[in-house]
């Protein structure tokens, strides 16, 4: 049941009033406004947009709106020395060159400052050598190459198709395999859905379209030169050699027309199986090198990008809480884009803008939320979540004491099929209850709830009659709040049908073709999916900021902890002999989970019964709920990943986008059969079980009666 217990309350100032104020037409208008020119991080255009948003949020009625600036390491192509890849003959002559940039979309021919496709933070270099095709460049792809096929990537240039995992993991894997350069490309198998035209006549990727993106392996560090601390005016900066997460080999992205020219000549080994074949008319030979007639030809990369310390600007808006102003509910999404940002991020930024407008309208009518709501327009997300991370580093002491929840608001859509939610288990019940109150925008579900269409289209694999809610991974601005600070976090957007569309993300992701027209013509002409996402994100923020008792259910954490413990135990049990030899036991973990379950159950009973009119007891119970997520934080962090401190969840070490449960144990067990010192390896497994068990038990105790 929605709450309406803020100060100056009148019957209309409740969740319904807030939701009714949200308008699809406004989101459409804001999206158009935000996408007419590029807003690359560190540019004047993006600074001007920051000031525009600051001004508009003030007009909408927020109490204060400030710019928070930082000087962080960014990366740009050299304007006079473009990046490209060549095929060179035995004389060193370039007989083929890849495109220098994408052909512009219709209507944008005269737009200046479109950054050409590049891999942000690639070092400079002009390596030349034989090509090896490495499929998606996942950990398992390199295992297949090196262990099964005995192909050595050392000193080779590897070509990998985008998709499946974060591009930074691909580059890291290539580096570890000894490659001297990486070419990333979009294969039509992953970025061209059958039966759909390419842009501008549909939402598929044209042959000249290219995905930009950063290739860092920051592991939550933020600005590579100031890990752990804000990149402010008096910051001490590391030298570039000590910077966190920078790639050591040149990397460059290309489209499938250019990839065709590189792959069609490949010789060497045939692909190991059909999963290594894309949709181009090429053999997908692994190499190394080109086939017979072309064996003397090599591939040469020409990369001249530069890393530069550049000023970025977050916009931080505040709507002060009437009752608990020292409790913060944060709604944040980024503003910087690679080019026009039609989907990423402006479909999210437009939704945030409308949510701010709606809250502002209520505030102008005398309403205030119970708790403070902070709104953020983050900068430099595309360069490694830099704006959000620097701000959180600067405000970490406040956030860890006052942070109730963080709701992320990047792209509102990646498809138009159904809802997709990733969040802490604490928010499961909030999401379920909210979506039951919202109308579904889906065709065939007129008059039905969002919960119903979502559950039908994306059912939970474990619980019948419930929708799938996924683990939080990373690759977006919630990372620092959840993985480092332990603030309950969630995200929601409309997505594609993953069963019928096997391509990775959406085809035009991070290309010049991600325009307003892409959204308006092909994804959401009525902006009804955007409106639904605004209702979900805004509704979550409203309820988190306004409900008397925080809408967190700790029993849902108990359920998933048991599931995760079972899962990690079954992984370990693939090695029964070693578990016996090294006396590996999960008893402590299962015991801690059992204790957590019992204590959470008792806490929930007390939560139903306590005197909500007693502000001290109310605050005490709410603090136990707020600090539960914090209790899963290990101040020492995960091994070699000090800024990933959540013991239950972390981004996968093999794919930043994916969440892994009990990551410390998982990583200790990963590929353990190949470790040179099994005794040491299983000792680390035991240590990680100990850390996990202790953390779960400690978290459980935060829910016990205080005295």
């Amino acid at each position: 049941k929605s709450s309406n217990e803020a100060t100056n309350i009148t019957p209309k100032h409740n969740m319904k009033a807030f939701l009714d104020e949200l308008k699809a037409e406004n989101i459409k208008k804001f999206l158009y406004n935000f996408t007419q020119i590029p807003h690359l991080a560190g540019t004047e255009q993006n600074f001007q947009l920051a000031k525009q948003i600051q001004s508009q949020w003030k007009e909408f009625g927020l109490d204060s709106v400030e710019l928070a600036h930082y000087d962080v390491l960014l990366s740009y192509p050299n304007k006079t020395h473009p990046n490209y890849i060549s095929i060179i003959n035995e004389d060193g002559n370039e007989i083929f060159n890849t495109s220098l940039f994408e052909p512009p979309p219709p209507g944008y021919e005269n737009v200046s400052d479109i950054v050409p496709p590049f891999s942000a933070f690639s070092p400079q270099g002009m390596p030349e050598g034989d090509l090896v095709y490495v499929n998606y460049a996942r950990t398992e792809d390199f295992f297949k190459l090196e262990r099964d096929m005995k192909i050595n990537c050392s000193g080779k240039i590897v070509i990998a198709r985008y998709g499946k995992v974060f591009r930074g993991n691909k580059v890291k894997n290539a580096q570890l395999a000894g490659a001297k350069g990486v070419i990333l490309y979009s294969d039509p198998a992953d970025y061209f859905a059958p039966g759909v035209k390419s842009y501008p006549d549909g939402w598929n990727l044209p042959g000249g379209g290219v995905q930009r993106g950063n290739i860092l392996n920051l592991n939550g560090a933020g600005d590579p030169l100031t890990p752990g601390y804000p990149a402010n005016e008096y910051a001490y900066r590391r030298g570039i050699a000590e910077a966190v997460g920078l790639p050591s080999i040149p990397v460059h992205p290309i489209g499938y027309y250019d990839a065709q020219k590189l792959l069609e000549k490949m010789g060497g080994s045939a692909p190991p199986d059909s999963s290594w074949r894309g949709s181009l008319k090429v053999p997908y030979n692994v190499g190394p090198g080109f086939t017979g007639n072309f064996s003397t030809q090599k591939v040469k990369m020409h990369i001249h990008s530069t890393n530069e310390v550049t000023r970025i600007y977050n916009v931080i808006g505040t709507l002060r809480g009437a009752v608990e102003p020292d409790r913060y509910v944060i709604l944040g999404g980024h503003r910087d884009s690679w080019v026009f940002g039609g989907i990423d991020p402006q479909s999210g930024a437009a939704v945030v803008h409308e949510i701010v407008r709606s809250f502002g309208t209520l505030k102008k009518e005398g309403w205030r939320p119970r708790r403070t709501i902070l709104f953020a327009s983050w900068d430099a997300e595309e360069f490694g979540l830099l704006g959000s991370t620097e701000w959180a580093e600067e405000n970490s002491r406040l956030l860890q004491e006052r942070g109730v929840a963080y709701i992320n608001a990047d792209s509102s859509i990646e498809g138009n099929y159904t809802l997709r939610v990733d969040c802490t288990p604490l928010m499961y019940s909030l999401v379920h209850n909210l979506t039951k109150e919202l109308k579904s925008p889906d065709e065939g579900f007129e008059g039905k709830s969002l919960y119903e269409s979502w559950t039908k289209k994306s059912p939970s694999p474990e619980f019948s009659g419930m929708p799938r809610i996924s683990k939080l991974g990373s690759g977006n601005d919630f990372e620092v709040f959840f993985q480092r600070l332990g603030i309950a976090s969630g995200r929601a957007r409309y997505t594609k049908n993953w069963e019928t569309n096997k391509f990775s993300g959406y085809p035009l992701y991070h290309s010049v073709y991600e325009t307003y027209e892409l959204v308006e013509k092909f994804y959401d002409p009525m902006f009804k999916y955007h409106l639904t996402v605004a209702q979900v994100r805004g509704g979550m923020v409203f309820e988190l900021a306004n409900s008397i008792v925080l809408p967190f259910d700790c029993r849902d954490y108990a359920v998933v902890l048991r599931k995760y413990a079972d899962k990690i135990y079954s992984i370990s049990m693939k090695h029964p002999q070693e578990m016996k030899t090294y006396s590996v036991s999960f008893d402590s973990l299962f015991s801690a989970v059992k204790n957590f379950t019992e204590i959470a159950s008792k806490f929930s009973e007390r939560l139903q019964d306590f005197d909500k009119s007693n502000p001290i007891v109310l605050r005490m119970m709410n603090d136990q709920l707020m600090f539960l997520e914090r209790a899963f934080i290990d101040p020492l962090g995960l091994p070699d990943r000090p800024f990933y401190r959540h013991v239950i969840y972390a981004p996968s070490s093999h794919n930043k986008y994916a969440g892994e449960s009990f990551p410390g144990i998982y990583d200790a067990l990963f590929d353990i059969e190949s470790k040179v010192d099994p005794s040491k390896a299983w000792g680390e497994v035991k240590r990680q079980i100990y850390v996990a068990a202790f953390t779960v038990q400690a978290a459980a105790e935060t829910l016990s009666e205080v005295a």
């Epitope: 083929f96 495109s99 220098l100 512009p104 219709p106 021919e109 006549d201 044209p206």
Partner: antibody, heavy 119, light 106 residues
Framework: EVQLVESGGGLVQPGGSLRLSCAAS????????MAWVRQAPGKGLEWVAN????????FYADSLKGRFTISRDNSKNTLYLQMNSLRAEDTAVYYC????????????WGQGTTVTVSS | DIQLTQSPSSLSASVGDRVTITCRAS?????MYWYQQKPGKAPKPWIY???NLASGVPSRFSGSGSGTDYTLTISSMQPEDFATYYC?????????FGQGTKLEIK
């Protein structure tokens, strides 16, 4: 075999109108963009207009906007160019061509039809 | 609009000569396309996406370039190569052609 056959050319007075047609065969017409290109006597090639698969998007040379209209009838596998307010400088051979998509070149051309604008 | 300037406008060559035609764009384009036209005939696609030979085009033809400067090269002129060659950009609309280069027998 892909075939494009233009028709409708002829002699017309300045200020007059003409409608060119291009009959397509040997391929799925609705799967391709189509274009018109012209060539004045003794001169080079000049792009006139093109049209997307279903006719919902059209593109024109700036100098011809408002006078020329490109259209298509996918049920008849035919491309059209309606030319109004014709001028002497519109005298040319008009070729129709096929494009895979917006960013792709004309991979097949017709043999052309001659338009002469003269009093 | 992107202007394309071909040079030379005309060229006299002998059979066996190596011939290079250049096409300069007024601003950068991602690729260049080339057509061959013989008198009284429709143009034929000759080179696509800068360096790819169209079906049936002899291997003595090659294309190269990037940014604003592109070339079509004939390594050894043959009698059937005497024709007019046009460059065209499909990078951005309006689509534009070069003014043509006429190859004549010396």
């Amino acid at each position: 075999e892909v075939q494009l056959v233009e028709s409708g050319g002829g002699l017309v007075q300045p200020g007059g109108s003409l409608r060119l047609s291009c009959a397509a065969s040997g391929f799925t017409f609705s799967d391709y963009y189509m274009a018109w290109v012209r060539q004045a006597p003794g001169k080079g090639l000049e792009w006139v207009a093109n049209i997307n698969y279903d006719g919902s998007s059209t593109f024109y040379a700036d100098s011809l906007k408002g006078r020329f209209t490109i259209s298509r009838d996918n049920s008849k596998n035919t491309l059209y160019l309606q030319m109004n307010s014709l001028r002497a400088e519109d005298t040319a051979v008009y070729y129709c061509g096929r494009q895979v998509g917006y960013y792709d070149p004309m991979d097949y051309w017709g043999q052309g039809t001659t338009v002469t604008v003269s009093s | 609009d992107i202007q394309l300037t071909q040079s030379p406008s005309s060229l006299s060559a002998s059979v066996g000569d190596r011939v290079t035609i250049t096409c300069r764009a007024s601003s950068s384009v991602s690729h260049m396309y080339w057509y061959q036209q013989k008198p009284g005939k429709a143009p034929k696609p000759w080179i696509y996406r800068t360096s790819n030979l169209a079906s049936g085009v002899p291997s003595r033809f090659s294309g190269s370039g990037s940014g604003t400067d592109y070339t079509l090269t004939i390594s050894s002129m043959q009698p059937e190569d005497f024709a007019t060659y046009y460059c065209q950009q499909y990078h951005s609309y309006p689509l534009t052609f070069g003014q043509g280069t006429k190859l004549e027998i010396k």
